[in-house]
């Protein structure tokens, strides 16, 4: 059976069909256990250092949001009135918006333990890993052991509120030239 605790770094060597293959033992997200903080700098706390989103390819991340992530957020929120939650989290520029998006998407909060397994979160993680220089390394470095067993997804009202905040942050990310309200 699968081990409950996995080692994030471990890769196993196999012979493949003519090519070469090394299979990662742990194919779950590495996740993050940092709690939600507000930052206006575009920096994310990650262990002893911060990830700076300044050099991301914002246009490609925006395209990924518009083509797919936005639809997954809408699907998650289906059945919820758009006026049900007030937007209380804001961001001032694109790096700051990504900082807040990263924090709300991947960091556990009271009442909403994890959104990280949701499709919009997986896609967000992929977009950041692909188009933010060095971001993927910060994820590999999140080596704290994590349960391999998938937690049952529970859509709480708090999670819906959090995803509503995320929709607002993404909308703001897409309109960087607008003056802060």
């Amino acid at each position: 059976g699968l081990n409950d605790i996995f080692e994030a770094q471990k890769i196993e060597w196999h012979e493949g069909g003519g090519g070469s293959e090394q299979k990662l033992i742990s194919e779950e997200d590495l996740g993050s256990s940092h709690h939600h903080h507000h930052h206006s700098s575009g920096l994310v706390p990650r262990g002893s250092h911060m990830y700076d989103f300044t050099n991301c390819d914002f246009e490609k991340i925006k395209a990924a949001y518009l083509s797919t992530i936005s639809k997954d957020l809408i699907t998650y929120m289906s059945g919820t009135k758009s006026t049900e939650f007030n937007n209380t989290v804001s961001c001032s520029n694109r790096p700051h918006c990504l900082t807040e998006i990263q924090s709300l998407t991947f960091n556990p909060t009271a009442g909403c333990a994890s959104l990280a397994k949701e499709m919009f979160a997986m896609k967000t993680k992929a977009a950041l890993a692909i188009w933010c220089p060095g971001y993927s390394e910060t994820q590999i470095n999140a080596t704290q052991a994590m349960k391999k067993r998938r937690k049952r997804k529970v859509t709480t009202n708090k999670c819906l509120e959090q995803v509503s905040q995320l929709q607002g942050l993404w909308r703001r990310f897409n309109r960087p030239l607008l003056k802060q309200q």
């Epitope: 990662l24 194919e27 993680k125 590999i140 470095n141």
Partner: antibody, heavy 120, light 107 residues
């Protein structure tokens, strides 16, 4: 077990196009990007671009932009790399390689390579 | 584009000797460097990822170190099957790039 099986060798005329396939099996196709890397005879490795099934998008090395098109058919877990306006210097072995996009983030499995020869 | 410069181009050593391969990046890339081994007619094989992360199934005589711009692959005691070409690759940002390779040959 994970396998990336590429299409067979091709001989092409200058100015024509070639489309190489890479059939993936043994893993969840959308959890990985598929990268394409080429190696000219006796030369080093050159990254061409990638297709990210999870985001349904591709990204390219500017050296190949406009000539290379990287796509995938998620229903068959097959990635494709098409290179147009071929010239003799495109003679190379073309490799596909998977890379995790939500974990691992490294090219940990490679196809066996497809030799494309461009000759008049 | 990030340029990776590998040195030396060729390393002539005997089995049992220690091999030290260098990879220098044209700009800071943290630890986003991976090392591959390639033998004639074969696809590259991943040895080390993110500068120093080892892979089970790869002999522990292979180790990696470095961060920022300078990276090293060390083979502590060369075995006959280790004579091959070694490439470093960066995944810090697009376009991904490879070094030109170091050939480790039998002296």
């Amino acid at each position: 077990q994970v396998q990336l099986v590429q299409s067979g060798p091709e001989v092409k005329k200058p100015g024509s196009s070639v489309k190489v396939s890479c059939k993936a099996s043994g893993y969840i196709f959308t959890d990985y990007a598929m990268h394409w890397v080429r190696q000219r005879p006796g030369q080093d490795l050159e990254w061409m671009g990638t297709f990210i099934p999870l985001l349904d998008t591709s990204d390219y090395n500017q050296n190949f932009k406009g000539r290379a098109t990287i796509t995938a058919d998620k229903s068959t877990s097959t990635a494709y790399m098409e290179l147009s306006s071929l010239r003799s210097e495109d003679t190379a072995v073309y490799y596909c390689a998977r890379m995790g996009v939500t974990h691992s983030y490294v090219m940990d499995a490679w196809g066996q390579g497809t030799l494309v020869t461009v000759s008049s | 584009e990030i340029v990776l410069t590998q040195s030396p181009g060729t390393l002539s050593l005997s089995p049992g000797e220690r091999a030290t391969l260098s990879c220098r990046a044209s700009q800071h890339i943290s630890r986003s460097v991976h090392w591959y081994q390639q033998k004639p007619g074969e696809a590259p094989r991943l040895l080390i990822y993110f500068a120093s992360q080892s892979i089970s199934g790869i002999p522990d005589r292979f180790s990696g170190s470095g961060s920022g711009t300078d990276f090293t692959l060390t083979i502590s005691r060369l075995e006959s099957e280790d004579f091959a070409v070694y490439y470093c690759q960066q995944s810090y940002s697009f376009p991904y790039t490879f070094g030109r390779g170091t050939k480790v040959e039998i002296k």
